[in-house]
């Protein structure tokens, strides 16, 4: 706490300007009117205040707005935003995308801080859903943002917002998240033609069920191996050799190079050796010819 002291004669600030950088902390506290500061917040960013001086300015705003800052002030916080705690931010009601952008810009190039996470959470909750413009903004600043959300949070993403998602935005998503996003993407891109559809849906296929993969295999999509290996193992295992060959096209050759990794390894073990031989890759480990395959999970379900 800065001690309450009277402002020295002639030092009362009439506006927020560069002369204030020469004020001691107690002088800023005594001589800068909080209401003036609030109306001239946009000037603070242009003035090279020290961290200690910024602490004083924050303190003045906290006193003026104990229930939380109004958006007119929040939008112009600039570097003062870095002084805010998640507790401070939870008091705010941020509704403007411009305000959100302005504050994200302050933190640009850094990891998502607890303050930013709280700000985004408040903003999205206030809007009720992750609309396309918000998603566009958030993924532009934080490509991994989408994958930081829980499956429950992702369920509020409307299919229309999926158009804003870039492949790199999904790099760190796990299968549970893709399970939620894939049906939305399927819906969003449903009116596109075959090759265009595949380009758009490709990044989301980690959430695709077997029947959709079978359908894709009939469309000459030539899925690359990196995409294939991100598919759900349980979705890949039922695919036949012919279906995988059609799905991967020329990239099926790469199964040999990746035969020790899942889901390739598990898939190989499920195929008949005769069928694997048709791939011309020398893949081994398939079911020997003449052996009968029993699906024990089906047997248990029947008993």
């Amino acid at each position: 706490e800065v001690e309450k002291t009277a402002c020295p004669s002639g030092k009362k600030a009439r506006e927020i300007d560069e002369s204030l950088i020469f004020y001691k902390k107690w002088e800023l506290e005594a001589c800068v009117d909080a209401a003036l500061l609030a109306t001239q917040m946009d000037r603070v960013n242009a003035i090279p205040f020290t961290y200690e001086q910024l602490d004083v300015l924050k303190h003045k705003l906290d006193e003026l707005y104990p229930q939380g800052y109004p958006e007119s002030v929040i939008q112009h916080l600039g570097y003062l935003f870095l002084k805010m705690s998640p507790e401070d931010i939870r008091k705010w009601n941020v509704t403007s995308l411009e305000t959100l952008k302005a504050l994200l810009e302050v933190n640009k190039g850094h990891e998502m801080s607890p303050q930013v996470a709280t700000l985004i959470d408040r903003f999205v909750k206030g809007r009720g859903q992750l609309d396309k413009d918000t998603l566009d903004t958030l993924t532009a600043f934080y490509p991994g943002y989408l994958c930081s959300l829980s499956p429950e949070e992702l369920s509020s993403v409307p299919p229309s917002s999926i158009w804003a998602v870039r492949p790199q935005d999904l790099d760190t998503c796990d299968p549970r998240q893709l399970d939620v996003l894939y049906p939305k993407a399927r819906l969003a891109f449903q009116n596109m033609n075959g090759s265009e559809y595949f380009v758009k849906i490709q990044s989301f296929l980690g959430g695709a069920p077997t029947e959709d993969l079978k359908a894709l295999s009939q469309q000459n999509v030539s899925m690359d191996l990196a995409t294939f290996m991100k598919l759900r193992t349980d979705a890949v295992l039922p695919l036949t050799v012919a279906e995988v060959q059609k799905l991967l096209g020329p990239h099926v050759e790469g199964l040999k190079a990746e035969e020790r990794h899942r889901p390739v390894r598990d898939w190989i073990l499920r195929q008949r050796q005769d069928d694997l031989d048709t791939l011309g890759l020398g893949l081994q480990g398939g079911i020997p010819n003449g052996y009968l395959v029993l699906d024990l999970s089906m047997q248990e379900a029947l008993s």
């Epitope: 690359d224 990196a226 790469g254 190079a257 990746e258 890759l281 020398g282």
Partner: antibody, heavy 117, light 113 residues
């Protein structure tokens, strides 16, 4: 020892076709895909396509899609690459190359195809 | 198509010195599941067929001298010849085998200074 022996040099007129062969030995022929790559004089390498020697399925670079055909004769462990509607810019050395997984582990000696009127 | 950009176009290095060739792809070549980078390096000596040196960006093909090494991940890759020998005079190519059409870099000519 893996060996890929290609057919000899060819001189063709524009509009004609050429068929280059690549005879493989020293390994199980049906266990490795074969690729074709070409190199114009003084230029870099260009991938043309690949073929599964077990099934005969082939895949082509779209640049050559309408003009190239790759085939296989398992009885002689030979793959063929036929390029039709030849033009002067098809003058190049054509290589067959055996896959090592995805990369090209063994290369033939190359076949020079000259297209000239 | 994935574009492969090699630099420099040519390189003159003294015998016994290090030669470094760079290759940049227009999109990632990393398989995030297996952590393999789908990039190979080839050496082509004058009048000869290309020869495989490195695959998966850093795995040396058997029989290739250990002065050749590959590094990098994602979109940026490097081939290093730690101590250049006279027999290393050649053109070196990188190639992506992530997605068809498989594409090559323009080549880097390595000569003796």
């Amino acid at each position: 020892e893996v060996q890929l022996v290609q057919s000899g040099a060819e001189v063709k007129k524009p509009g004609a076709s050429v068929k280059v062969s690549c005879k493989a030995s020293g390994y199980t022929f049906t266990n490795y895909w074969m690729h074709w790559v070409r190199q114009a004089p003084g230029q870099g390498l260009e991938w043309m396509g690949n073929i599964n020697p077990s099934s005969g399925d082939s895949y082509y670079n779209e640049r050559f899609m309408s003009r190239v055909t790759m085939t296989v004769d398992k009885s002689t462990s030979t793959v063929y690459m036929e390029l039709s509607s030849l033009r002067s810019e098809d003058t190049a050395v054509y290589y067959c190359a055996r896959s090592g997984g995805l990369w090209l582990a063994f290369w033939g000696q190359g076949t020079l195809v000259t297209v000239s009127s | 198509d994935i574009v492969m950009t090699q630099s420099p176009d040519s390189l003159a290095v003294s015998l016994g010195e290090r030669a470094t060739i760079n290759c940049k792809s227009s999109q990632t070549l990393l398989n995030s599941v297996s952590q393999n980078n789908y990039l190979a390096w080839y050496q082509q000596k004058p009048g000869q067929s290309p020869k495989l040196l490195i695959y998966f960006a850093s795995t040396r093909e058997s029989g290739v001298p250990d002065r050749f090494s590959g590094s990098g991940s994602g979109t940026d890759f490097t081939l290093t010849i730690s101590s250049l020998q006279a027999e290393d005079v050649a053109v070196y190519y990188c190639q992506q085998h992530y997605r068809t059409p498989y594409t090559f870099g323009g080549g880097t000519k390595v000569e003796i200074k």
